[in-house]
Interface confidence: low
Amino acid sequence: KLTIESTPFNVAEGKEVLLLVHNLPQHLFGYSWYKGERVDGNRQIIGYVIGTQQATPGPAYSGREIIYPNASLLIQNIIQNDTGFYTLHVIKSDLVNEEATGQFRVYPELPKPSISSNNSKPVEDKDAVAFTCEPETQDATYLWWVNNQSLPVSPRLQLSNGNRTLTLFNVTRNDTASYKCETQNPVSARRSDSVILNVLYGPDAPTISPLNTSYRSGENLNLSCHAASNPPAQYSWFVNGTFQQSTQELFIPNITVNNSGSYTCQAHNSDTGLNRTTVTTITVYAEPPKPFITSNNSNPVEDEDAVALTCEPEIQNTTYLWWVNNQSLPVSPRLQLSNDNRTLTLLSVTRNDVGPYECGIQNELSVDHSDPVILNVLYGPDDPTISPSYTYYRPGVNLSLSCHAASNPPAQYSWLIDGNIQQHTQELFISNITEKNSGLYTCQANNSASGHSRTTVKTITVSAELPKPSISSNNSKPVEDKDAVAFTCEPEAQNTTYLWWVNGQSLPVSPRLQLSNGNRTLTLFNVTRNDARAYVCGIQNSVSANRSDPVTLDVLYGPDTPIISPPDSSYLSGANLNLSCHSASNPSPQYSWRINGIPQQHTQVLFIAKITPNNNGTYACFVSNLATGRNNSIVKSITVSA
């Protein structure tokens, strides 16, 4: 079947179209093209006779048409009026006619569109904006792009006028974007240049920075104001309601307490005509003066005087703080603070109260410290100590004694021998001593400030022969498995060897026995009852030797588990019951009896005459050592048969 294909079907103005013939019959005489859907001589474009290969133009020929031997028709430089149907009339050799109709549409080549707007400076939340895509073109489709994306779905966006107009209702600052329109028809598509929507907004409520509202006197105040706004806001500053300046920043150097108050930033948008303000309250605190400490007693005497330390100057509505030894005040009944904390009183000062003391003045911004103050506590003298501790010397050696007593101010020292003043020095030196130098050596320490004196007396023996030693003990009645005992061999003598004996034997090897202090001290750890022996110490030098009298260690122990005798547990009715209880204990324990839990008598022996079956039961002996604080008991069952 004869058909006509239009290539292309949609033709742009100025371009060309080929009406291509398919299934052209054979044995043709000729063919002719007509404008329209039927054969009409008045609308013939061109005719063609195959035998002569002669083309004859018709009334509708425009000079832009070319006919090909295969009957196809090329139309060049297409114009809008070329749109429509074209009919091919074919005349076969047998003079039988055949017709086919084709068509194409002509569209203009679209120009580059542009966007017009009904409002170049819309105000946020107030105005609407209508964008229109120009020019208006027949048979064109209109599209819109926002920031190169297709239109978002929004109730505030509306298309109208065949999509040629885009309306934004109630614009917001977020509508500030790049808008483009696009026109399309079957032969072309063109996009406009971007149009940026300039939404006027603000000012929003201004923000004042920094957020800090507290300042110290002498600092610089530098406040900055910012409010979101288009166009940018104009700023004004007011202090306590009084206009200061029209700048975004407010700078006041070296502020004082008088600069405290309300600071208002006003932002103004000249295009929207709107004003917004923000207020911040600035507080300027006076820099506290550096505090200092005064004392009502610069030289207090230990255990006698009280001292009141006061933090100066006195300032109203100020917090006073105290530190001792760089720590906050310890809890002590000897430390008292006044109601306002300004005065710290030390009751009955001691030498440990020297400090240093600091006070501080605190306001909302800072704490300022005083310089530290140290108390000069007068104390002592304590009991003097004479060294070395030897009391026995051999003739011919030098005697060198030193005295020391804790004291503030340092003590003044005097030496006396047998009550006679010798010299006013801290050290006493006697060379090449003899027996005549034996006697009572007294050191006297004197504190001139407190007026107090203390003395210590030491007996010095000068002898070629060693004295008979003696044993001193730190615990005369140690408890077994609990206490330790330290025996010390007296006196302490120069160049002397110390020896120990137990029950006349040299010391046994035991981890519980320890010698120290040049063998002068013998310590028994964790004493047992077996340590209750006779202890002797001896001293010897190159000239002589001597032994102490024995000292017997009295170890407290027990009570051990008691034993009830006789061991019998079965008795005949009518017999006498005579039970005796015994427990190892030092000192001897106290005894008590209970029969079937009922207390009886506080005796070591329990006697019941002519027992009967009623005397069946449990017989308990209780022992108690008041010295060791320990108790013990044993229970025995007695059966009496009839």
């Epitope: 550096k290 703080l321 530190w323 760089n326 720590q327 906050s328 600091e358 501080g360 605190q362 911004l365 800072s366 704490v367 300022d368 410290h369 310089d371």
Partner: nanobody, 124 residues
Framework: EVQLVESGGGVVQPGGSLRLSCAAS????????MGWFRQAPGEEREFVAA????????YYADSVKGRFTISRDNAKNTVYLQMNSLRPEDTALYYC?????????????????WGQGTLVTVSS
Amino acid sequence: EVQLVESGGGVVQPGGSLRLSCAASGLTFSTYTMGWFRQAPGEEREFVAAIIWSGSNTYYADSVKGRFTISRDNAKNTVYLQMNSLRPEDTALYYCAAQHFGPIGLTTRGYHYWGQGTLVTVSS
């Protein structure tokens, strides 16, 4: 975030000098007492020097008195330790610490923030 960054450490001969710096950020520097501490290998951290927020009071350990000087520049948020007449026993890792108001701390207790330390080696 509070940061204390020490610098200025190094190797120096006995009798020599060093100046340590500690730059503070993330805190209101002018309200903090600043201290220097040091820790020798195997030893506990010990107090060296401290300066209260205003700079008016300074404190020193007995072992450094007369040789070390602590100072601060509140405008630069920096505290310094000038170390003169250095001795081998001054060899340690030196730490900067910050304590908000309060008394001068002579122990590590009470210091809120610490730096990472800078090493000072005194050796011939």
